[in-house]
Amino acid sequence: VPLDPISVSNSSSQIILKWKPPSDPNGNITHYLVFWERQAEDSELFELDYCLKGLKLPSRTWSPPFESEDSQKHNQSEYEDSAGECCSCPKTDSQILKELEESSFRKTFEDYLHNVVFVPRKTSSGTGAEDPRPSRKRRSLGDVGNVTVAVPTVAAFPNTSSTSVPTSPEEHRPFEKVVNKESLVISGLRHFTGYRIELQACNQDTPEERCSVAAYVSARTMPEAKADDIVGPVTHEIFENNVVHLMWQEPKEPNGLIVLYEVSYRRYGDEELHLCVSRKHFALERGCRLRGLSPGNYSVRIRATSLAGNGSWTEPTYFYVTDYLDVPSNIAK
C-alpha cells in the first residue's frame, strides 16, 4: 500500500496528492493508479434550519497543506473546534517492534487479498479522463433480492439543481496513471467540494495489472471567490395587505450549498432590520414575505451564506409601501 498519502488543495479546482512508496512492495512498483470521486455533502446539511437560535453554522474547510490520511478529521468534522495543537510522543522500543510486525502482517494480508478476494484487472489504456475498464470485481456473495422498479415518467422540472447527488462510484470514476513519481496534481475539480481519493501501487503493467489494496485520503477544494453571490435581480411583489414578497435566484454553483440567506431591510429614516431565511423556507417561497410593513420607502439587500461563508450583499432594491387600510387579504397568513 502506498504510504502517508497527503492531500493539499492549492486552488478551487485542484488538489495536490503526495505519497511515499510502499515500505515492503511485492516486486517492483511500475506505476500508481489514482482514482477520485466527488463526495456528497452530509444530508443533514440540507435538512437543518440554520436560522434557529443556537444552531451553529457548519464549518467546512478546504484541505490545508500536509493533510495526511490520519489528519482527515479536520475536514470531515461536522463543526469546527479549536483544540490546541499537539505533537506526538517519541516511540518506545515495543511500539517500534509492533510496527515492524504490522508491516509484515500487512504484506501477507495484501497477498491474501490479491489472490482470494479480488480478480485481477485486464490491461488498460487509461487516458486519465475516465475509467473504461470494469471495476475490480468482488467474488459473488450471492444474488441480490428482487427489486421493484416503478415505470419512469417525464419529470416536470428540468434537473438543474446545483446540489445534485454525485454519480455513483461505479459510473466511470476519473483516474490517472502515475509513472516514476510519487505525486499528482488533480485538476478540473468543482470548487469547495469534498473528494475521496483512492491510491494504489501496481507492480505489473501487462498482461494483467496487479495492484495493491487502496490507500484512501479525503480532500476539499478551495472556495470560489464569487460563487455565493446572488446574481440577477431581487424582485418584489406588493400584495394588497402590505405584504411584500421578495424573490431572488439561488446562486447557480455555490461553495458546497447555501444554508441560509440574510435579508436586511429598512424604511427610510428607520434603523435596519434583519431577517434570516433558511434553506427550507427559501425552497418553499423562493424568497421571503415581509408582513405588517408601515407605509414608506424601503430598501432591501440580501446575501447568501454557504458552507464556505458569506457571499456579497446584493445591490439595494427599493420599493414603496402605500398607506393601505386594513382590508382582508387574499394572500395566506
Epitope: 444530508s43 428540468p158 438543474t160 411583489e237 439561488e250 427550507k280 418553499l284 414575505r289 394572500i331
Partner: antibody
Framework: QMQLVQSGAEVKKTGESLKISCQGY????????IGWVRQMPGRGLEWMGI????????RYSPSFQGQVTISADKSISTAYLEWSSLKASDTAMYYC???????????????WGQGTLVTVSS | QTVVTQEPSFSVSPGGTVTLTCGLS?????????PGWYQQTPGQAPRTLVY???TRSSGVPDRFSGSILGNKAALTITGAQADDESDYYC??????????FGGGTKLTVL
C-alpha cells in the same frame, strides 16, 4: 429519473384508520417540499397541505387542519397521509406532488404521484 | 376564504385557439401568485403544463403558453388537437405553503 410512487388502493369502513404513502425516487427527497391533493369523485382538485421531509415541518390548508395528519420518514424517502377515523366523505383519489425544487424559479407543483384511491363504505 | 375562478367549460375546433382564464374572487392575479396550469385526462394523475405564470414544463408542446391577461392568469392553446380534450386546473400560490386550485375547466375539442 425523478418520480413519486404512491401506495395501492384502499377499501375501508367508516371509523377505521388509514395511512397511505408516497415514495420519492431520483432526487434529494429531504430537500423538497411534498404536498397532498384530494380529488373527490367527479370533482376538482383540493389542496390539503405540505411537508418538508428534512425536519417534518407541515403546513395544512384550513379545511384539512385536524382532519388528517401529514408525516414523513426521510430514511425511506416516504411521505404519508393519515386518518385516525375515516368518514364516507373521505372517499376520494389522493395525489402527492412535489413542490418545485430550489433551482426552479417560482412556486409550483411539478411532479405528481399516480394517485391512491381511498374508498370508505359505511 | 379565497376563491379561484375558472370557466366551467369551453369548446374549441381542431386547429383553433382557446384561452382559459384563472381569476380571484377579490383582487387581481399577478405573477406573485406564481400561477400554474395542470391538465388532467379521465383516470389519470394531473400533469403540470405551465408553472410560474409562463414557464412550460419539460416535454410540454409549445402550443401551450401561460400569461397574465388583465387581472387574470391565462392558458392559451394554439392549434388545438383532439387529445387536448381534458380538464384544466389553475392553481395560485397563496404563501406559507398554501395553494388554491380553481374549479377546473372542461375543454371539448369539437
Amino acid at each position: 429519473q425523478m418520480q413519486l410512487v404512491q401506495s395501492g388502493a384502499e377499501v375501508k369502513k367508516t371509523g377505521e384508520s388509514l395511512k397511505i404513502s408516497c415514495q420519492g425516487y431520483g432526487y434529494r427527497f429531504t430537500d423538497n417540499w411534498i404536498g397532498w391533493v384530494r380529488q373527490m369523485p367527479g370533482r376538482g382538485l383540493e389542496w390539503m397541505g405540505i411537508i418538508y421531509p428534512g425536519d417534518s415541518e407541515t403546513r395544512y390548508s384550513p379545511s384539512f387542519q385536524g382532519q388528517v395528519t401529514i408525516s414523513a420518514d426521510k430514511s425511506i424517502s416516504t411521505a404519508y397521509l393519515e386518518w385516525s377515523s375515516l368518514k364516507a366523505s373521505d372517499t376520494a383519489m389522493y395525489y402527492c406532488a412535489r413542490h418545485a425544487p430550489l433551482a426552479v424559479a417560482g412556486m409550483a407543483l411539478g411532479d405528481w404521484g399516480q394517485g391512491t384511491l381511498v374508498t370508505v363504505s359505511s | 376564504q379565497t376563491v379561484v375562478t375558472q370557466e366551467p367549460s369551453f369548446s374549441v375546433s381542431p386547429g383553433g385557439t382557446v384561452t382559459l382564464t384563472c381569476g380571484l374572487s377579490s383582487g387581481s392575479v399577478s405573477t406573485g401568485y406564481s400561477p400554474g396550469w395542470y391538465q388532467q385526462t379521465p383516470g389519470q394523475a394531473p400533469r403540470t403544463l405551465v408553472y410560474n405564470t409562463n414557464t412550460r414544463s419539460s416535454g410540454v408542446p409549445d402550443r401551450f403558453s401561460g400569461s397574465i391577461l388583465g387581472n387574470k392568469a391565462a392558458l392559451t392553446i394554439t392549434g388545438a388537437q383532439a387529445d387536448d380534450e381534458s380538464d384544466y386546473y389553475c392553481a395560485l400560490y397563496m404563501g406559507s405553503g398554501t395553494y388554491v386550485f380553481g374549479g377546473g375547466t372542461k375543454l371539448t375539442v369539437l
